[in-house]
């Protein structure tokens, strides 16, 4: 019989206690936004934001610039002092809340937890290859405002998420908070809203569209928005939420809010249920049928899919989808089963099961006892009734209000729970020749590059590396600049390729050089390593 | 100091291609919204169409199968394209930069074009 | 197309006095509370000059004798007091709609 090489088991080809160092910026504070710009010029820039300040780095992460944007009240606040001669409010430290970018001006805005929640607007000065901010417009007239109505209170303390869409010549700003009763009451945000920048950028526009949590429903019915994006003709909320206005408010579910981007206005606001599983291949006794529910949503991304994936998802190649993170509850604690499950969800079909959502509701014969729901923004009432109506008037389209659609969008875990005890709090997604990978955060201050494919009974790492030494969470919000990703853990903001920082965790020469092409791998005397690392002989064909 | 300037031929043949060159100084055409208007000779104005800072075009309606707008970033240029030209196309021509809402701050001075054979 | 019909189509003002150009829109131009109304200027040989925008905000470097007013469909632009330098064509413009459309023109005489 012939004698054969033993094989090495997989997980031993590779090292993931490897150090891999990239680059990093100490922001000083734990950072709370961050934001990248590139322009046209092959000039960019990252925007880092921490409790009151704002820091511009350089594509290189070094500081061209920085900000003082609080404490309110503070003379040293720069962003403050753009409101002319003070007080603005109540003094506080400012921590940020909303940072944007308007890429027409091309302006940075910032929104902060301190004097109402008001912007200001940062024009971008590029200078080589760098990008300075002209001194801050403070977006907000106080004649235009008063705490019942504020076009110019964008942010809550709780959490604002903000996507700017260009409509014609303006953009117009989507925006979405978390309310309860005291931030209600003072200067409303506004739990969902559509503002419009006004031309001299004094402000938001006087008259802006907004839905908003009732005030009975404030105190036990709170929502917090995970993700916003903007994807063909509209612009998608993600939420956390209590399944029910009546039921306990602990228990939990994700939503997908859809908004029109083309039509500024609330008539075609949607709401569909996510519901993220996990079930594994050989059920266990008393698991429940259809898997376990990961009801909470972490995380989010929507990204076009490589060809692979698309395949295994019956979608073409391309095509958006939306990724999230799901844990079973708020904590996101160990229960039976992985800590965290990743689920796929093509827009185009979220899209589709929205619409005949509408038909069952607005169509024809109607099922009797279909509500319409989001009785948390609207008086309950009946399909196809408007809200708090009866019946529908002449003049009155059913189409035209507020819908939670009826069914929920049912997804498996994409890993099978390999995931394990990882607890993942970043993700961005990306496709690499015809590869998706999903680049993820962790709650021990890690990073895993893993190839997004649902047939394998094993993960497929680019990478699974220690930022550093601290052991802190990496933050939830993701940011590209050219082929490196922007995470942040703690106090620093740490640049990943997104390539993956390098080979020296293959171990082996055969495991080396079946790595994805875009790494770059090859066998270099005795490690696996990129070209420019390998002075000597550098082998991507063959194994010694 | 924002400057933009019109250049090409003041006469093009019936059914020829009107083509125009915009050059601006003081501003980067990576930023805001970058228009063509023109004015016939009976003093009636009329909007053609833009390129945006992302190079996104929107055309008049009443143009759209004949009219291009396009850029060239390194040249900080833009350009007008108008197909299939009749008589009814001579007017002056302007391009126009606008920062928000169709508010044209700046102005080229305009250039002549007569459509005759 | 959103049609404006400006009135008077001339207009002849004395210096020192006050000089109204009204602007009538085809359909509402308001919009998000903000009437989406801009006005212009021209003389002879020159390229238009945006003097009011929103209606009633001035432009840049535009002295403080131009005022516009109004919302809905009914707009107008005062300039008070006229300056002989004031001679020229006005347009009014919405830009509510695309395609942006613009006024037939109003002539100012100062006399």
């Known amino acids: 019989e012939d004698w054969q090489c033993p094989r090495t088991p997989y997980a031993a080809s590779r090292d993931f206690d490897v150090k891999y160092v990239v680059p990093s910026f100490s922001a000083g504070g734990l950072v709370q936004a961050m934001v990248t710009y590139e322009g046209d010029r092959n000039e960019s820039a990252v925007f880092v934001a921490i409790r009151n300040r704002l820091h511009v780095l350089g594509p290189d992460l070094k500081s061209v610039q920085s900000l003082a944007t609080g404490p309110a009240g503070d003379p040293g606040c720069q962003t403050c002092a753009a409101c002319g001669p003070g007080p603005h409010g109540p003094p506080g430290d400012t921590d940020t809340k909303v940072l944007v970018l308007d890429p027409a001006l091309p302006a940075l805005v910032s929104c902060g937890s301190s004097l109402q929640g008001r912007c200001f607007l940062h024009d971008l000065e590029p200078q080589g290859t760098a990008v300075h901010l002209a001194a801050p417009a403070c977006l907000f007239s106080a004649h235009h405002n008063r705490p019942d109505d504020c076009p110019d209170c964008v942010a809550s303390p709780l959490g604002t998420r903000v996507t700017v869409v260009e409509q014609g010549q303006a953009s117009y700003f989507y925006v979405a908070s978390s309310l309860d009763a005291a931030v209600a009451a003072s200067f409303s945000p506004r739990s969902v809203s559509i503002r419009r920048l006004k031309a001299d950028a004094s402000g938001f526009a006087p008259g802006f569209v907004a839905l908003s949590v009732l005030p009975k429903h404030l105190v036990s019915y709170s929502i917090e928005y995970v993700h916003s994006f903007h994807t063909g003709a509209f612009v998608y909320f993600l939420t956390v939420q209590p399944a029910s206005v009546t039921d306990d408010p602990s228990a939990l579910h994700t939503r997908l809010a859809r908004l029109s981007a083309t039509e500024p206005e609330l008539g075609d606001y949607r709401e569909l249920v996510l519901d993220c599983r996990f079930a594994p291949k050989r059920r266990r006794r008393g698991a429940p049928e259809g898997g376990q529910p990961y009801p909470v949503l972490r995380v989010a991304h929507s990204a076009p899919v490589g060809a692979q994936l698309a395949t295994e998802l019956s979608i073409a190649e391309g095509q958006e989808v939306l990724f999230g993170v799901f844990v079973t509850g708020k904590d996101g604690g160990p229960g039976v089963g992985p800590n965290s499950v990743v689920c796929a969800f093509p827009i185009d079909l979220l899209d589709t099961l929205i619409d005949e959502g509408v038909e069952r509701c607005c169509e024809s014969p109607v099922h009797p006892g279909l509500r319409r729901g989001l009785d948390f923004f609207q008086s309950p009432s009946f399909c196809p009734n408007p809200p708090g109506l009866e019946a529908l008037s002449p003049n009155t389209s059913c189409r035209h209000f507020p819908l939670l659609v009826s069914s929920s969008f049912s997804r498996v875990d994409l890993f099978n729970g390999l995931l394990g005890p990882v607890q993942v709090t970043a993700l961005y997604v990306t496709r690499l020749d015809n590869v998706t990978v999903a680049h993820m955060g962790t709650m021990d201050g890690r990073i895993l590059q893993v190839e997004l494919v649902r047939s394998l009974n094993y993960l497929l790492y680019v990478s699974n590396f220690s930022l550093g030494d601290s052991g802190q969470p990496v933050q939830r919000d993701v940011s590209r600049l050219g082929d490196h990703l922007l995470f942040a853990s703690g106090d620093q903001v740490f640049q990943v390729p997104i390539q993956g920082p390098g080979c020296r965790h293959f171990l082996t020469c055969g495991r080396c050089l079946r790595a994805w092409h875009f790494m770059g791998c090859g066998w270099c005397g005795n490690m696996c390593g990129q070209q420019k690392e390998c002075p000597g002989s550098w082998q991507q064909d063959h194994c010694p | 100091e924002v400057q933009l300037q019109e250049s090409g031929p003041s006469l093009v043949k019936p059914s020829q291609t009107l083509s125009l060159t915009c050059s601006v100084t003081g501003d980067s055409i990576t930023s805001g919204y970058w228009n063509w208007i023109r004015k016939f000779p009976g003093n009636k104005l009329e909007y053609m169409g833009y390129?945006?800072?992302?190079?996104?075009?929107y055309y008049n309606p009443s143009l759209k199968s004949r009219i291009s707008i396009t850029r060239d970033t390194s040249k900080n240029h833009y350009y007008l394209q108008l197909i299939s030209v009749t008589a009814e196309d001579t007017a002056t021509y302007y391009c126009?930069?606008?920062?928000?809402?169709?508010?044209?701050?700046?102005w080229g001075q305009g250039t002549s074009v007569t459509v005759s054979s | 197309d959103i049609v404006l019909t400006q009135s008077p189509a001339s207009l002849a003002v004395s210096l020192g006095q006050r000089a109204t150009i009204s602007c009538r829109a085809s359909e509402i131009v308001d919009n998000f509370g903000i009437s989406f109304m801009n006005w212009f200027q021209q003389k002879p040989g020159q390229p238009p000059k945006l003097l009011i925008y929103?209606?009633?905000n001035q432009g840049s470097g535009v002295p403080a004798r131009f005022s516009g007013s109004g919302s809905g469909t009914d707009f107008s632009l005062n300039i008070h007091p006229v300056e002989e330098d004031d001679t020229a064509m006005y347009f009014c413009q919405q830009s509510k709609e695309v395609p942006p459309t613009f006024g037939g023109g109003t002539k100012l005489e100062i006399k």
């Open positions: 390129i945006s800072y992302s190079g996104k075009t």
């Open positions: 126009a930069r606008s920062k928000y809402d169709y508010a044209m701050d700046y």
């Open positions: 929103a209606a009633s």
